[in-house]
C-alpha cells in the first residue's frame, strides 16, 4: 500500500524525488567513465513522517514501533521505489564500451 | 554489488537484522488481527557507513555525494533487501481468514 | 589479421526481411562493442546501433522496432536483423569495431567492406 | 534525438590553404565525437576520435577542437589526398545512448 502523499511538515520536507548535479570527480569514477562527464543524480531525499508513502507493510509497522521505541526503532527512510537506466561510457581492458547501468538514477520514491 | 560486510564502527553497530517484540496493541492491529498475540517482528537497523553493505550503484554514488555534502545528502538507509512472508488469522466481513503478508518481516539488509 | 566482413546483402523485395552477418577474426569478439552503419548511393552515412560487449542493444531511433543487432561470440559474428524493408532502406551496410567516438587499444579503425541492400521490387 | 549538423555542405579550398569544418551536435556530448573522411567506393577512415585526438597514422596537419555541442575540424595544409567528404559522428549517452553522423562536408579543389 502506497500511502499518503500529503506532508504535513510543509511542502518539500517529506521524501521526495530530489536532483544532484555530481562530476564524474565527486562520484570518484573520472578513472573509468569517459562520458558523460556530468551526472544529474536523482535520488531520494525527505522525511518519513507517519504513514507518508509508505512502501509496504513493513513501513507501516516501523512506523508504529518508532512512535513506541524512538530510540531503538528508527523511522522509515526514503528509498527509491524503482530507478532509471543511465547509460556510461567506460573504459575497459580492451578500450571503450557502453554499459547501461539499472540501478543507478532513482526513478520514484517511498519510504520503508 | 554488495559491498564489505565488515563494520568499521564496531560489532553491531552497522545495519543489520534485529528483533523487536511487538504485541497486536503496539502494532495497531488489535481491532483486526486475531494472532498471533504477539510478533517477533525481523527489521534492518543500524548505520551504513561508506561502501558497508552497498545494494547498488545507486547507494555507492550516496555515499560518495555524502561525504562532500553531508547537508544536502543524507547517507545510505539500512533497509530490507528481502523478506520473509507471515501469516495472519484476521478478521474479515465473514468471519476469520488466513492471509499471507509477503512484505512484513524483512529477512535481510543492505544499505541504499 | 584483424578483419571485419559482412555479408547477407542483396534484392529483397519491400516488405521482406533480411538478416546481415558481420565476421570478424584476428580479435576476441567478446571483448568489444560493434557498431552497424549504412550508407545509401550517393548519401551520408547513418548509425544504426550498437550491441555492447555485454551484448546490450543501442539504436537509434528511426531504427527501433525494424532492426536488431546480436551477436554470436561463439561464432565471432554479428548480426543485423532488418524487416519491414522499404525501398529507402537501400544501401551499403557496415560493420565495425568499437563505439567509434572513443578509441579501442590497438587498430583504431576497423571497418568492412560493407555489403549492398537493394529494396525494389 | 541526437542530430549533428555539419557546416559548410561544400568548401572549395586551393591546396595548400587550410580549411576549417564544423559540427553542431543538438545535445551536449562532451566529448563523444570522431570525424572520419571518405572517399568513393571506400569504407570511412577515422582521423579523430574524443574530439581532438588525432587516430594512429593520421598526419599531424589534421586536428580536432571543441566540447559540448560545438566541434571544428582543422586542416592545416591541404594536400591533394585530402580532398574527399568528410563526416562527424556523435554519441549521446544518458538513459539511453544514441549516435548521428552529421550530413557531411564535401572539400573540393578550387
Known amino acids: 500500500a502506497r500511502n499518503g502523499d500529503h506532508c504535513p511538515l510543509g511542502p518539500g520536507r517529506c521524501c521526495r524525488l530530489h536532483t544532484v548535479r555530481a562530476s564524474l570527480e565527486d562520484l570518484g569514477w573520472a578513472d573509468w567513465v569517459l562520458s558523460p562527464r556530468e551526472v544529474q543524480v536523482t535520488m531520494c531525499i525527505g522525511a518519513c513522517p507517519s504513514q507518508f508513502r509508505a512502501a509496504n507493510m513493513h513501513a507501516q509497522i516501523k512506523t508504529s514501533l518508532h512512535r513506541l521505541k524512538p530510540d531503538t526503532v528508527p523511522a522509515p527512510c526514503c528509498v527509491p521505489a524503482s530507478y532509471n537506466p543511465m547509460v556510461l561510457i567506460q573504459k575497459t581492458d580492451t578500450g571503450v564500451s557502453l554499459q547501461t547501468y539499472d540501478d543507478l538514477l532513482a526513478k520514484d520514491c517511498h519510504c520503508i | 554489488a554488495r559491498n564489505g560486510d565488515h563494520c568499521p564502527l564496531g560489532p553491531g553497530r552497522c545495519c543489520r537484522l534485529h528483533t523487536v517484540r511487538a504485541s497486536l496493541e503496539d502494532l495497531g492491529w488489535a481491532d483486526w488481527v486475531l494472532s498471533p498475540r504477539e510478533v517477533q517482528v525481523t527489521m534492518c537497523i543500524g548505520a551504513c557507513p561508506s561502501q558497508f553493505r552497498a545494494a547498488n550503484m545507486h547507494a555507492q554514488i550516496k555515499t560518495s555525494l555524502h561525504r562532500l555534502k553531508p547537508d544536502t545528502v543524507p547517507a545510505p538507509c539500512c533497509v530490507p533487501a528481502s523478506y520473509n512472508p507471515m501469516v495472519l488469522i484476521q478478521k474479515t466481513d465473514t468471519g476469520v481468514s488466513l492471509q499471507t503478508y509477503d512484505d512484513l518481516l524483512a529477512k535481510d539488509c543492505h544499505c541504499i | 589479421e584483424v578483419q571485419l566482413l559482412e555479408s547477407g546483402g542483396g534484392l529483397v523485395q519491400p516488405g521482406g526481411s533480411l538478416r546481415l552477418s558481420c565476421a570478424v577474426s584476428?580479435?576476441?569478439?567478446?571483448?568489444?562493442?560493434m557498431t552497424w552503419v549504412r550508407q545509401a548511393p550517393g548519401k551520408g552515412l547513418e548509425w544504426i546501433g550498437i550491441i555492447s560487449g555485454s551484448g546490450s542493444t543501442y539504436y537509434a531511433s528511426w531504427a527501433k522496432g525494424r532492426f536488431t543487432i546480436s551477436r554470436d561470440n561463439s561464432k565471432n559474428t554479428v548480426y543485423l536483423q532488418m524487416n519491414s524493408l522499404r525501398a529507402e532502406d537501400t544501401a551499403v551496410y557496415f560493420c565495425a569495431r568499437g563505439i567509434l567516438v572513443y578509441a579501442d587499444y590497438g587498430d583504431h579503425n576497423l571497418w568492412g567492406q560493407g555489403t549492398l541492400v537493394t529494396v525494389s521490387s | 534525438d541526437i542530430v549533428m549538423t555539419q557546416s559548410p555542405a561544400t568548401l572549395s579550398v586551393s591546396p595548400g590553404e587550410r580549411a576549417t569544418l564544423s559540427c553542431q551536435a543538438s545535445?551536449?556530448?562532451?566529448?563523444?565525437l570522431a570525424w572520419f573522411q571518405q572517399k568513393p567506393g571506400q569504407p570511412p577512415r577515422l582521423l579523430i576520435y574524443?574530439?581532438?585526438t588525432l587516430a594512429s597514422g593520421i598526419p599531424a596537419r589534421f586536428s580536432g577542437s571543441g566540447s559540448g555541442t560545438e566541434f571544428t575540424l582543422t586542416i592545416s595544409s591541404l594536400q591533394s589526398e585530402d580532398f574527399a567528404v568528410y563526416f562527424c559522428l556523435g554519441v549521446y549517452t544518458y538513459i539511453s545512448a544514441e549516435g548521428a553522423f552529421g550530413q557531411g562536408t564535401k572539400v573540393e579543389i578550387k
Open positions: 545535445e551536449d556530448i562532451y566529448t563523444n
Open positions: 574524443a574530439a581532438s
Open positions: 584476428g580479435f576476441s569478439l567478446s571483448s568489444y562493442d
